[in-house]
């Protein structure tokens, strides 16, 4: 015979074809072998011109031989070489599917590989590719979009060889809160890292507000609305500034009375105050906290103390906010002017967290009376709020 070729090569099959001998022959003897593969020999009819090779090993170079027989006579042998395809990984599955994450797992191919190419694509056409190592059989997908259909494909690699792709389809779950109205809802969406987040007042996407979320203190889910830490920001500001807010949310800042009013109008909120000074820490929690609107001059409601700092906010309960240019306190003198800050002053303060940073003069500094008195300016202070029923919401999410 002549013209021996292979066609339709896969990872486990190939088709051998040849030109028949000119003379009539009784049969053809076909043999094929590969590295670490025992030789297989088959005899076929003399009028056959092709033979299906099966049960081949993947990614293996085979040597194929064929000769003709007529009675006791044998023709010369012709030879061809071919390499089977790399077989595909198997059983690609998406598990642990969340709103923004999923875990892909697969079984490796029979052939040795040098890696895998993973491709995942959303219905909007966003495609991402990643190459992972040869010993990997799972991969965590992150930064996915909620409520989105994805097609994930995987292909084995071995040098220049590439297997066929296999695929799986999955859909990420929807966010519990597509437009979180506070940091607790952001946390219940699965965001557990403290930092900047966008919240939506009353869940309205038109009312976006960038806030700093504390996701670690006492279970997390806190909107930080005041931070003092280094004295770089000027807190001796006017009414307009305190209404709107000022500063860098990552550093020292005040979120704004208008924002506090809108946030606390969304439901029942609790207040947490964290204080730190020369390695000492203290905290105060109030289970009822709200700030009125501009008509009430942002009247404070704060009740239900627990903690280690001492109940210094009770003195300010029911008071309107005061700044040097809008004196609403009950003192004859202007408390904000006297103490170079702003607060829900009475006459004047037990708490002066917006006082002069580092000023240890009586009542002038960052004070929390029942912790460090009025003659010590506290180094670090944060005020933050979250829904009073956060513990219940958190438990419900865990059960879900």
């Amino acid at each position: 015979p002549s013209g021996l070729v292979t066609a339709n090569i896969t990872d486990s099959e190939a088709l051998a074809r040849w030109q028949p001998a000119i003379a009539t022959v009784d049969s053809y003897v076909i043999s094929y072998t590969g590295e670490k593969v025992p030789e297989i020999t088959r005899t076929v009819s003399g009028n056959t011109v092709e033979y299906a090779l099966t049960d081949l090993e993947p990614a293996t170079e085979y040597t194929l031989r064929i000769f003709a027989e007529k009675g006791p006579q044998k023709s010369s042998t012709i030879t061809a070489k071919f390499t089977t395809d790399l077989d595909s990984p198997r059983d690609l599955t998406a598990t642990e599917v969340q709103s923004e994450t999923a875990l892909l797992t697969w079984r490796p191919p029979r052939a040795s590989v040098t890696g895998y190419l993973l491709v995942y694509e959303s219905v909007d056409g966003t495609v991402k590719e990643v190459i992972v190592g040869p010993d990997t059989t799972s991969y965590s997908l992150a930064d996915l979009s909620p409520s989105t259909h994805y097609t994930a494909k995987i292909q084995a690699l071995n040098g220049p060889l590439r297997s066929n792709m296999i695929q799986t389809i999955f859909t990420t779950i929807g966010l519990l809160y597509p437009f979180p109205k506070d940091c607790s809802q952001a946390m219940l969406n699965g965001d557990t890292t403290s930092g900047l987040y966008t919240i939506y007042l009353n869940g309205d996407k038109a009312e976006a507000l960038e806030v700093f979320c504390d996701m670690t203190s006492d279970g997390g889910g806190w909107i930080v609305f005041l931070r003092r830490k280094n004295g770089r920001e000027n807190f001796y500001q006017n009414w307009k500034a305190y209404a709107a807010g000022f500063g860098d949310r990552r550093e020292e800042f005040w979120l704004g009375l208008d924002n506090l009013n809108k946030i606390t109008a969304q439901g029942q909120y609790e207040l947490r105050v964290d204080l730190r000074d020369h390695g000492e820490t203290a905290f105060a929690v109030y289970d009822k906290f709200s700030v009125g609107d501009a008509k009430t001059r942002y009247k404070l409601k704060v009740e239900g103390y627990s903690g280690t700092a001492g109940d210094s906010m009770a003195y300010h309960n029911g008071r309107s906010f005061s700044t040097f240019d809008k004196d609403t306190d009950s003192a004859i003198t202007n408390c904000a002017l006297s103490y170079k800050g702003a607060f829900w002053y009475r006459n004047c303060h037990r708490v002066n967290l917006m006082g002069r940073y580092g000023d240890n003069n009586h009542s002038q500094g960052v004070n929390w009376f029942h912790w460090k008195g009025h003659e010590h300016s506290i180094q670090f202070a944060e005020m933050k709020l979250r829904p009073s029923n956060f513990r219940n919401l958190e438990g419900r999410r865990k059960r879900a």
Epitope: Y305, A314, Y315, S330, R346, N347
Partner: antibody, heavy 120, light 107 residues
Framework: QVQLVESGGGLVQPGRSLRLSCAAS????????MHWVRQAPGKGLEWVSG????????YYADSVKGRFTISRDNAKNSLYLQMNSLRAEDTALYYC?????????????WGQGTMVTVSS | DIQMTQSPSSLSASVGDRVTITCRAS??????LNWYQQKPGKAPKLLIY???NLETGVPSRFSGSGSGTDFTLTISSLQPEDFATYYC?????????FGQGTKVDIK
């Protein structure tokens, strides 16, 4: 309207004990801190002790610290002052007073007082 | 403890007079200062809290001022029912302390 009625006063020998009570009505008792203030015959006012609305924080004048204990039973709308190791100088009219808030702030409304006489 | 010193200890005045009583704290107390009136055989009555805030129901002839360490109670026009003993009290820190009292009697 707010009413505070003290009881439990009387004549007692030095070194003995006495327990004063104050029955409160006309307001949500556990929303307010309470005080004991005394006045020796012909003398001025002396703050003795105070307790927060929850009962979680208590405060004392140095002259009674370690001898007197303030407590409250919010379920019974009652304030108490347990006075041990009584001395002659503890002789006074003892007033209970309601604060304006839940923490130590301003004694606002006062009862009519109960007389304690320490004498042998 | 914070000492509270009132002056004068006593004063005689006539109906219609303007009367001023002062109170000095031994240390800075912001505006944590209250004034009480006590009549013989009666319990003290809160007149002014937070140095200058008139308690509900107290006549407007009573007024308070001051902050820090020096405070004043003023009765703008003394009435017959105002003859009594007046006490200042600091609520800045515990133990709370009272002044020794100022007795206002009829001249």
């Amino acid at each position: 309207q707010v009413q505070l009625v003290e009881s439990g006063g009387g004549l007692v020998q030095p070194g003995r004990s006495l327990r004063l009570s104050c029955a409160a009505s006309g307001f949500t008792f556990d929303d307010y801190a309470m005080h004991w203030v005394r006045q020796a015959p012909g003398k001025g006012l002396e703050w003795v002790s105070g307790i927060s609305g929850s009962g979680g924080s208590t405060y004392y004048a140095d002259s009674v610290k370690g001898r007197f204990t303030i407590s409250r039973d919010n379920a019974k709308n009652s304030l108490y002052l347990q006075m041990n190791s009584l001395r002659a100088e503890d002789t006074a009219l003892y007033y209970c007073a309601k604060d304006i808030s839940a923490v130590m702030d301003v004694p606002q409304t006062w009862g009519q007082g109960t007389m304690v006489t320490v004498s042998s | 403890d914070i000492q509270m010193t009132q002056s004068p200890s006593s004063l005689s005045a006539s109906v219609g007079d303007r009367v001023t009583i002062t109170c000095r704290a031994s240390q800075y107390i912001q505006g944590f200062l209250n004034w009480y009136q006590q009549k013989p055989g009666k319990a003290p009555k809160l007149l002014i809290y937070d140095a200058s805030n008139l308690e509900t129901g107290v006549p407007s002839r009573f007024s308070g001022s001051g902050s820090g360490t020096d405070f004043t109670l003023t009765i703008s026009s003394l009435q017959p029912e105002d003859f009594a003993t007046y006490y200042c009290q600091q609520s800045y820190s515990t133990p709370q302390t009272f002044g020794q009292g100022t007795k206002v009697d009829i001249k």
